[in-house]
Interface confidence: low
């Protein structure tokens, strides 16, 4: 038997017996040039909802370094450089997969983990709650 | 690379060819509630740099479904609803880890792959090149 795939030869993760442990080759195939996000673009500085990038490091995780965005302002920056508090800077979050060492400190054994990271910020119109 | 601690209860991995292949438990530990990004927030609609979410599906990849953001406008939406082309809507991109089946169709064997995905859009001041 085999854990049944959704496509010839591929497991279906919706079934409870999707193989719990698989072999993963850590020779990363990179479909794009990996760069420090600070160097990849200067959007974090030029945005109307600018953000700072904070380094989050965890040796028990792969990748061990993740950059987290923190919006600089509650409001959004106007053309004149002042902050408009009628608008809101909000983080854009994404769920990403990381590998977590399990048991701890073991180099060859990992568990897949989903974590929520803030990638950058965007400027949104606030939701106004009208009081009756 | 991965920081490799010494621990007597773990396989030896001190040699130069730190195991290219590791065991990964696919019982995902979720540190947050997994949701369809369209439901997680309505920022994509309320942003001054709104975006659409496109479903990217690949059965040879885990996760097989990834949502890609595409900015709706070249410019940014003003308070009056018109687009300001003196500003630019740009995608915020992030490198994420995915598992790629290798060899293809094999249920138990994967390679780690980095791919660049657009998570959302932000409004930036354009870089103006002054012509002498």
């Amino acid at each position: 038997g085999i854990a049944i795939p959704r496509n010839s030869g591929c497991p279906n993760s919706e079934d409870k017996n999707f193989p719990r442990t698989v072999m993963v080759n850590l020779n990363i195939h990179n479909r794009n040039t990996s760069t420090n996000p600070k160097r990849s673009s200067d959007y974090y500085n030029r945005s109307t909802s600018p953000w700072n990038l904070h380094r989050n490091e965890d040796p028990e995780r792969y990748p061990s370094v993740i950059w987290e965005a923190k919006c600089r302002h509650l409001g959004c920056v106007k053309a004149d450089g002042n902050v408009d508090y009628h608008m809101n800077s909000v983080p854009i979050q994404q769920e990403i997969l990381v590998l977590r060492r399990e048991p701890r400190h073991c180099p060859n054994s990992f568990r897949l983990e989903k974590i929520l990271v803030s990638v950058g910020c965007t400027c949104v119109t606030p939701i106004v709650h009208h009081v009756a | 690379g991965i920081a490799i601690p010494r621990n007597s209860g773990c396989p030896n991995s001190e040699d130069k060819n730190f195991p290219r292949t590791v065991m990964v438990n696919l019982n995902i530990h979720n540190r947050n509630t997994s949701t369809n990004p369209k439901r997680s927030s309505d920022y994509y609609n309320r942003s001054t740099s709104p975006w659409n979410l496109h479903r990217n599906e690949d059965p040879e990849r885990y996760p097989s479904v990834i949502w890609e953001a595409k900015c709706r406008h070249l410019g940014c939406v003003k308070a009056d609803g018109n687009v300001d082309y003196h500003m630019n809507s740009v995608p915020i991109q992030q490198e994420i880890l995915v598992l790629r089946r290798e060899p293809r169709h094999c249920p138990n064997s994967f390679r780690l792959e980095k791919i660049l995905v657009s998570v959302g859009c932000t409004c930036v001041t354009p870089i103006v090149h002054h012509v002498a």
């Epitope: 010839s8 279906n12 409870k16 017996n17 | 138990n108």
Partner: antibody
Amino acid sequence: EVQLVESGGGLVHPGGSLRLSCAASGFTFSSFNMDWVRQAPGKGLEWVSSISTTSRIIYSADSVKGRFTISRDNARNSLYLQMNSLRDEDTAVYYCARVSYYGHGFDYWGQGTLVTVSS
Amino acid sequence: DIQMTQSPSSLSASVGDRVTITCRASQGISSWLAWYQQKPEKAPKSLIYAASSLQSGVPSRFSGSGSGTDFTLTISSLQPEDFATYYCQQYNSYPLTFGGGTKVEIK
């Protein structure tokens, strides 16, 4: 105790149909993928078809594609194999088998039911 | 499709003998191989999974080894109840395929 009991086998003419059933007990049927495997008289084992826990994913050997349909009823703890357009070469003992929880082959098999296709 | 070739197709051995059966895959299947034992008129019984892991309840005289394309089932000291036919099966990818079987007979 895990038990898989097949039924529905018998003699059928070429071109005819038959429906095999497999009654499961002693485990949470809905948590396991299930398969059918057959064995022609005096021959080796041949995989026939697989079905996922939710019935969303189904695989069949090329030799039976378009003729045999695997299905399951989790409420009834039952696995089925609908066999149409039967041929002489389909004559075999048909086993229902449980896929191990982690997908490592078949950990339990039924006793089998004999299907004979002959004119 | 992945072809599984077992050898020998049959062998004669005595109680107490060490018996080795080999199975070769036409392409690499990592460690995704199972071994089954089948006695006449009976259903197959699972012995080994993941090439070398012993199914619970199976005597320790049975062992499996190998990865990639070449695999071995070893019975360290053949017992009277071990006379049967043995099959290997790959579950690396669909379609699932079995070896042709090895019949272990009494010498």
